[in-house]
Interface confidence: low
């Protein structure tokens, strides 16, 4: 979003004067943040502290774990996308607290903003990616037996990032600055050149691809998943089955604002009573939108205190507990184990 | 294609007061600082108004301060002058231009409308 | 206030020949970041003034090649390499660096 195609937030509120000495503003209240800009400063700082700390604790638990098992493989590469873009978030932060200044010039306006997209598309296409391991660990066991495998996984990773980076393009190639000095700023947003369609065909690729199409594939596969799983009296579902559907449906719960107002802003005229509302909350849907890089080391916790009882262990060792379960293949009677994940404890189903 | 057009002008007495125009159309007007300029019957060109791309900041030179007051109504993608207490000086061709990045300040006027101010 | 001073007040000029206006400022017209926010208007008689000129040498998508703009600091020009019958009416250069706006007193370019 952010976009002054021309669809920016209220850019004409900022006076630096530091930079142009301006006769004193009229408005004098406007110097004052709006509530959902301070809402999304309290949200970004939040999941700055979270998402860093938590992120960087996961890749450390995993990082050591990757080479024997996949699961670790699966929550390292979520990890690293959601500590790439809590990275931006102090430079964001900034730019809310001067009023959507953007002093940070055009190449960090290009991409600095684009890594929420890019973790969006990583993330997502990172879950479908586990989700279809889950599948084929209940409905393919022996194909897993056989083929499932580190390597696999790791191109299934780079497969995964080379997509996000293809569909996080068209939002690089729009992010331009603009300068504009009453009050004297530079902006950073979107520039579809007043091209509606061309606005509205990349907010609808958004919105299908990185959530509709996910959503409806990824209910399908974890409702045969869970149909699967209850059928076979494994009432127990492991924890990796529980988490990875914790994580899930947190992607869609914090990307919705973010994709509703997108698509609404795309199809509204920008002189409508709705488009300006919707354009004031931009900064907000943002900074929801960016909880997802900080919520899933709290699932990981959360579970990993529900398994233990109580947290009895120290954090890297109850992650560790939660993030590197193996994955053991159940299909009728028996029980076959992953050929690359041989250093597991035995725990029940999916 | 941008268009500025404007209405509201006239013959107005000293000391009166009149409220000058400006429609926008064919851009995405509530990002757009805008500004008002006059020209005078010497053919001088002089900023007279500017207000923010969201109206919250306006400025005005020490010549009309406290006398005309420049609005906008972005739902309406419309601009507005307000002039109060005119003065003959006030006798102007009166326009409403874009202005938002200092390189499109003032990349497209409007047609301009006659104030003039006597008794 | 910047003061902006315009010479010639008029100019004659044949068509096919070239014209030169040029514009000085009285303070430096060099922002912080680099850039100079000098800006060239044509009004042709009756009509209001439309801007053909921008960031001293950038030309308005519509502005035929034969209009160049130069210069640096406080001193800046405006050539027609080829004057052209449409060409005529007043040029105006406005400063944006500083505030306020501020305007040449213009020059009026006749067709002899």
């Known amino acids: 979003m952010d976009s002054f195609n021309y669809t920016t937030p209220d850019y004409g509120h900022y006076d630096d004067k530091d930079t142009l000495d301006l006769n004193t503003p009229v408005d004098k209240t406007s110097n004052t943040l709006r509530v959902p800009d301070i809402l999304a400063l309290v949200i970004f700082a939040v999941v700055f502290l979270v998402g860093v700390l938590g992120n960087a604790l996961v890749v450390w638990v995993t990082a050591f774990e990757a080479k024997r098992t996949i699961n670790a493989i699966w929550f390292l590469n979520l990890a690293v996308a959601d500590f790439l873009s809590c990275l931006a978030l102090p430079i964001l932060f900034t730019s809310i607290v001067q009023h959507h200044h953007w002093p940070f010039g055009g190449a960090a306006c290009s991409i600095l903003p684009s890594l929420i997209l890019l973790n969006m598309y990583a993330s997502i296409l990172l879950l479908a990616t586990i989700s279809a391991d889950r599948f084929l660990l209940v409905f393919k066991p022996i194909w897993c037996q056989n083929f499932r495998g580190a390597g696999l996984a790791w191109i299934a990773c780079a497969v995964a990032w080379g997509l996000a980076l293809l569909l996080t393009i068209p939002s690089f190639l729009y992010r331009v600055v603009r300068e504009e000095y009453f009050p004297p700023k530079v902006l950073c947003g979107v520039d579809y050149s007043h091209d509606k369609r061309r606005e509205r065909a990349v907010a609808i690729v958004r919105l299908v691809l990185g959530f509709l199409w996910p959503l409806l594939t990824l209910t399908i596969c974890y409702t045969f998943i869970l149909l699967r799983t209850w059928s076979r009296r494994a009432t127990r579902s492991t924890k990796t089955l529980k988490v990875v559907v914790a994580v899930v449906a947190s992607f869609f719960i914090f990307w919705l604002p973010y994709q509703v107002t997108g698509i609404m802003m795309s199809f509204l005229e920008p002189s409508s009573p709705t488009f300006l509302l919707l354009k004031k909350l931009d900064s907000l849907c943002v900074s929801f939108a960016y909880i997802n890089c900080c919520i899933n080391p709290i699932i990981y916790v959360v579970a990993g205190q529900g398994f233990q009882g109580r947290l009895r262990k120290s954090l890297p060792s109850l992650l560790r507990n939660v993030l590197t379960e193996e994955s053991v293949v159940r299909e009728s009677k028996s029980f076959t184990r992953s050929t690359v994940d041989t250093m597991a404890q035995k725990t029940q189903a999916v | 294609e941008v268009q500025l057009k404007q209405s509201g002008g006239g013959l107005v007495k000293p000391g009166g007061s009149l409220k000058l125009s400006c429609a926008a159309s064919?851009?995405?007007?509530?990002?757009?600082?805008m500004s008002w300029v006059r020209q005078t019957p010497e053919k001088r060109l002089e900023w007279v108004a500017t207000i923010s791309s969201g109206g919250s900041y306006t400025y005005y030179p020490d010549s009309v301060k406290g006398r005309f007051t420049i609005s906008r109504d972005n739902a309406k993608n419309t601009l507005y002058l307000q002039m109060s207490s005119l003065k003959s000086e006030d006798t102007a061709m009166y326009y409403c231009?874009?202005?938002?990045?200092?390189?499109?300040?003032?990349?497209?006027w409007g047609q301009g409308t006659s104030v003039t101010v006597s008794s | 206030d910047v003061v902006m001073t315009q010479s010639p007040l008029t100019l004659s000029v044949t068509i096919g020949q070239p014209a030169s206006i040029s514009c000085k400022s009285s303070?430096?017209?060099?922002?912080?970041?680099?850039?100079?926010?000098l800006n060239w208007l044509l009004q042709r008689p009756g009509q209001s003034p439309k801007r053909l000129i921008y960031l001293v040498s950038k030309l308005d998508s519509g502005v035929p090649d034969r209009f160049t703009g130069s210069g640096s600091g406080t001193d800046f020009t405006l050539k027609i390499s080829r004057v052209e019958a449409e060409d005529l009416g007043v040029y105006y250069c406005v400063q944006g660096t500083h505030f306020p706006h501020t305007f040449g007193g213009g020059t009026k370019l006749e067709i002899k």
């Open positions: 303070q430096s017209l060099l922002y912080s970041n680099g850039k100079t926010y």
């Open positions: 064919g851009f995405t007007f509530s990002s757009y600082t």
């Open positions: 231009t874009r202005g938002g990045g200092n390189y499109d300040a003032m990349d497209y």
